[in-house]
């Protein structure tokens, strides 16, 4: 906390400019008007303030806006955003995607901080759902964002937003998350033709039920082993040898290399040896 002291004669700030970097903390407190700071926030980032000086500027804004900053200030916080606590951010009402992008840019290249997580949470809750533009923005900054959401949170993602999801965005999703996302993807891509549909749905198949895998096996999709290995065990177990052979196409030979791994091991165990022998891979049930 900076002590309240009178501003020395001639030091009252008329605008936010580089001369302020020579002000001591107490001078900034005494000589910079909070309302002026709020209207000229966009200038702060161009000035090399010290961390201590930024603390003073934050303190001034906190005093001016005890209930939370207005979006006009938030959008121009820049590096001052890094000084905010999750508690500060919970007071905000961020509705503009441009504001969100501006603040994410400040944290770019770093892991998602508690501040960023709180900001995103506030933004998404304010919008009521995770729309396509928001998802596009968030996954661009944080490819793992989607998989950081709980199944409950994912349930608010509209099928239309699924078009924004790239395969790498699903890399760290667990089976429970894919269980929620798969039906949405199925709905989103339902009007596509066979081969195009498979390209789009492939990354989501870790949430697919047996009947959908059986249907895919009739479409010459040639699923690769990496995708097959991510399928739900309970969805794979009921598949026949013939269905798996059709599903994998030329990739069926890859089963041999994965025979000790789930879900291949579980599937092999539950097949008749005579059926496995038709594959000619030497798989032992």
């Amino acid at each position: 906390e900076v002590e309240k002291t009178a501003c020395p004669s001639g030091k009252k700030a008329r605008e936010i400019d580089e001369s302020l970097i020579f002000y001591k903390k107490w001078e900034l407190e005494a000589c910079v008007d909070a309302a002026l700071l709020a209207t000229q926030m966009d200038r702060v980032n161009a000035i090399p303030f010290t961390y201590e000086q930024l603390d003073v500027l934050k303190h001034k804004l906190d005093e001016l806006y005890p209930q939370g900053y207005p979006e006009s200030v938030i959008q121009h916080l820049g590096y001052l955003f890094l000084k905010m606590s999750p508690e500060d951010i919970r007071k905000w009402n961020v509705t503009s995607l441009e504001t969100l992008k501006a603040l994410l840019e400040v944290n770019k290249g770093h892991e998602m901080s508690p501040q960023v997580a709180t900001l995103i949470d506030r933004f998404v809750k304010g919008r009521g759902q995770l729309d396509k533009d928001t998802l596009d923005t968030l996954t661009a900054f944080y490819p793992g964002y989607l998989c950081s959401l709980s199944p409950e949170e994912l349930s608010s993602v509209p099928p239309s937003s699924i078009w924004a999801v790239r395969p790498q965005d699903l890399d760290t999703c667990d089976p429970r998350q894919l269980d929620v996302l798969y039906p949405k993807a199925r709905l989103a891509f339902q009007n596509m033709n066979g081969s195009e549909y498979f390209v789009k749905i492939q990354s989501f198949l870790g949430g697919a039920p047996t009947e959908d895998l059986k249907a895919l096996s009739q479409q010459n999709v040639s699923m690769d082993l990496a995708t097959f290995m991510k399928l739900r065990t309970d969805a794979v177990l009921p598949l026949t040898v013939a269905e798996v052979q059709k599903l994998l196409g030329p990739h069926v030979e890859g089963l041999k290399a994965e025979e000790r791994h789930r879900p291949v091991r579980d599937w092999i165990l539950r097949q008749r040896q005579d059926d496995l022998d038709t594959l000619g891979l030497g798989l032992q049930g």
């Epitope: 667990d174 089976p175 065990t233 309970d234 177990l237 000790r260 789930r262 165990l269 539950r270 049930g285």
Partner: antibody, heavy 119, light 107 residues
Framework: QVQLQESGPGLVKPSETLSLTCTVS??????????WSWIRQPPGKGLEWIGY???????NYNPSLKSRVTISVDTSKNQFSLKLSSVTAADTAVYYC???????????WGQGTMVTVSS | DIQMTQSPSSLSASVGDRVTITCRAS??????LNWYQQKPGKAPKLLIY???SLQSGVPSRFSGSGSGTDFTLTISSLQPEDFATYYC?????????FGGGTKVEIK
């Protein structure tokens, strides 16, 4: 409610064969999704998986014990058994039988039986 | 074989504490990771399967996360009955290995 119960001698001499049986009640050893495992725990140590069997008779053993282990199943008696040959003092442990649901994990365990290898 | 390394091997905590146990696999095991709780003289009990799914009947203060090689078991607010040893286990590879265990003791 499926329950498992281990039975067998609590004392085995070195170089002999340890034999244990697990009786399944309240369910069937012929379940489609389940495999039946043996797991052991030496006194004051961690858990070591020994091997499993499926009702078809297919088995899978811990590579470090494979040469000495045989697991068999008797679907008519709703039992599965463990034989561990050429035992030494290092095989002294609590032996557990357990059901593994392929969709979850070792969800049902027997209460365990202590087997001591000593002359 | 896939090695499973748990840390810490033991920890002291108080009732109400948030406790985190980690498990690392020597190679990727996707989401095939289970967590068990064992109390002295008792058989282990399945808590979490598939890295993050809560086994039926297990209190919601237990949660699991992770995929690939790094996994975490979290107890959000430690209760008196939670003092026990916790084991991770991988069912991905046919060698079914367990971690060395983490003993959670009363501080």
């Amino acid at each position: 409610q499926v329950q498992l119960q281990e039975s067998g001698p609590g004392l085995v001499k070195p170089s002999e064969t340890l034999s244990l049986t697990c009786t399944v009640s309240g369910g069937s050893v012929s379940s489609f999704t389940d495999t039946w495992s043996w797991i052991r725990q030496p006194p004051g140590k961690g858990l070591e998986w020994i091997g499993y069997i499926y009702y078809s008779g297919s088995t899978n053993y811990n590579p470090s014990l494979k040469s000495r282990v045989t697991i068999s199943v008797d679907t008519s008696k709703n039992q599965f058994s463990l034989k561990l040959s050429s035992v030494t003092a290092a095989d002294t442990a609590v032996y557990y039988c357990a059901r593994e649901d392929a969709l979850t994990g070792f969800d049902i365990w027997g209460q365990g039986t202590m087997v001591t290898v000593s002359s | 074989d896939i090695q499973m390394t748990q840390s810490p091997s033991s920890l002291s905590a108080s009732v109400g504490d948030r406790v985190t146990i980690t498990c690392r696999a020597s190679q990727s095991i996707s989401s095939y990771l289970n967590w068990y709780q064992q109390k002295p003289g008792k058989a282990p009990k399945l808590l979490i399967y598939a890295a993050s799914s809560l086994q039926s009947g297990v209190p919601s203060r237990f949660s699991g996360s992770g995929s690939g090689t790094d996994f975490t078991l979290t107890i959000s607010s430690l209760q008196p009955e939670d003092f026990a040893t916790y084991y991770c286990q991988q069912p991905y590879d046919a060698s079914y290995t367990f971690g060395g265990g983490t003993k959670v003791e009363i501080k």
